[in-house]
């Protein structure tokens, strides 16, 4: 009962890190830039994403701009748009491969896939979280790393936008929430009675040993 | 005190390269970016370009990228500028100046110039 | 790149006058502004940086104002040693540009 728990866990920890994943790759406040003159009044912000870049005036007035060109972009925002693409594609698919073995569905009857399917829906949304980080602490290093340099202008100069967060949340999510799936079937599904041994059994369950209770001594 | 002191003027042949050293003094030589500009007679100043010289780390002008190479001698708190491939366009008085801390392309202390001129 | 455009590269002046002399930058430069004074035969000095701050030294006859692409350099009362040519930079963006520059002639 406690595994189904962890594992409904997991997944709802998966789901909203999918969820936080998706929105920080659309959303365009990876970088901002608050340019503001002598006085204390922000004259302008600029918020910059993966897909398009927005200006919001002092008034509140906002606009947006898709990039243009593929080819013309930084290779690193190509790179990122990339990981961010195949982090979220890469959740859904172990989403698909977690249903197959969820203990609620009837895709596959074994037990012991069940679980295996279970365990690599957990594999697959933990490097979804890798992929995920991966373009977040890239860009966020970049952006300390030139806010720091004084050969960089002030014009040039970003700060970290809400999208980062976001992604670092979804990372940490997915992260969790694979590490959770990982862990409800530590040895392949095989911790509890069998659904056959189960039904013709008479006064004590027979349970599998599993390969480490065996003197391996007489097996050289 | 801070103090920027350049090397004297040069009179180099056509086609020839030369290189001129901003020493300086009166402050921690890798705490301030410095920069390097151009003033041709009787005419505004040109930026060339800066150097970290905590690290080496350059950026140039476009218009002087293959003409200007920056270099830094941490040991002797030295900046050099190296002017390649002379033509009667690089006479000029060049200057080195130091990046203001808070506002690195600012310049707030300047060398007292090098007189650069190219003739056959 | 950002163009800086001081609309007089000559002024005559006379001593005691009130001076003000402009710069006008191609796009917003937040500020980013610095006055220089340059004498025949010397390098630059740094008068005023960030638009209005005077640099330490500078005498308080001299004051910057402006905002977002215009600027000013005003002299309250001119003396003999404020005859000198005037630039004015942006270091807002790379490159750093320098306006044409103002030079005060006396009457």
């Known amino acids: 009962m406690a595994s189904a728990g962890m594992q409904i866990l997991g997944v709802v920890l998966t789901l909203l890190g999918w969820v936080n994943g998706l929105v920080s790759c659309a959303l365009p406040m990876w970088k901002v830039t608050a340019f503001i003159g002598n006085s204390i009044v922000v004259a302008q912000v600029v918020w910059e994403g993966l897909w398009m870049s927005c200006v919001v005036q002092s008034t509140g007035q906002m606009q947006c701009k898709v990039y243009d060109s593929l080819l013309a972009l930084p290779q690193d925002l190509q790179a990122a748009r990339a990981l961010c693409v195949i982090a979220l594609l890469v959740a859904l698919f172990g989403l698909l491969v977690y249903l197959a073995g969820a203990k609620c569905t009837t895709c596959v009857e074994e037990k012991d896939s069940k679980a295996r399917l279970v365990l690599t829906s957990g594999i697959v949304f933990v490097i979804s979280g890798v992929l995920t980080l991966i373009p977040v602490c890239w860009t966020a290093h970049a952006i300390i790393r030139d806010f720091y340099n004084p050969l960089v202008a002030e014009a040039q100069k970003r700060e970290l936008g809400a999208s980062l967060y976001l992604g670092w949340a979804a990372s940490g999510l997915l992260l969790l929430g694979g590490g959770l799936l990982c862990c409800t079937c530590p040895s392949g599904g095989s911790q509890g009675p069998s659904h056959y041994m189960a039904r013709y059994s008479t006064s004590a369950p027979a349970i599998s040993r599993g390969p480490s209770e065996y003197p391996t001594k007489n097996y050289v | 005190e801070v103090q920027l002191q350049q090397s004297g003027p040069e009179l180099v042949k056509p086609g020839a390269s030369v290189k001129i050293s901003c020493k300086t003094s009166g402050y921690t030589f890798t705490e301030n970016i410095r920069h390097w500009v151009k003033q041709s007679r009787g005419k505004s100043l040109e930026w060339i370009g800066t150097i970290n010289p905590n690290n080496g780390e350059t950026r140039y002008n476009q218009k002087f990228k293959g003409k200007a190479t920056l270099t830094v001698d941490k040991s002797s708190s030295t900046a050099y500028m190296e002017l390649r491939s002379l033509t009667s366009e690089d006479s000029a008085v060049y200057y080195c100046?130091?990046?203001?801390?808070?506002?690195?392309?600012?310049?707030?202390?300047w060398g007292q110039g090098t007189s650069i001129t190219v003739s056959s | 790149d950002i163009q800086m455009t001081q609309s007089s590269s000559s002024f005559s002046v006379s001593l005691g006058d009130r001076v003000t002399i402009t710069c006008k930058a191609s796009?917003?430069?937040?500020?980013?502004l610095a006055w220089y004074q340059q004498k025949p035969g010397n390098a630059p000095r740094l008068l005023i940086s960030?638009?209005?701050s005077l640099e330490a030294g500078v005498p308080s006859g001299f004051s910057g104002s402006g905002s977002g692409k215009d600027y000013t350099l005003s002299i309250t009362s001119l003396q003999t040693e404020d005859v000198a040519t005037y630039y004015c930079q942006q270091y807002w963006s790379t490159p750093p540009t320098f306006g044409g520059g103002t030079k005060l002639e006396l009457k």
């Open positions: 960030g638009a209005t």
């Open positions: 100046t130091r990046g203001i801390t808070k506002s690195p392309y600012g310049m707030d202390y």
């Open positions: 796009e917003d430069i937040y500020n980013r």
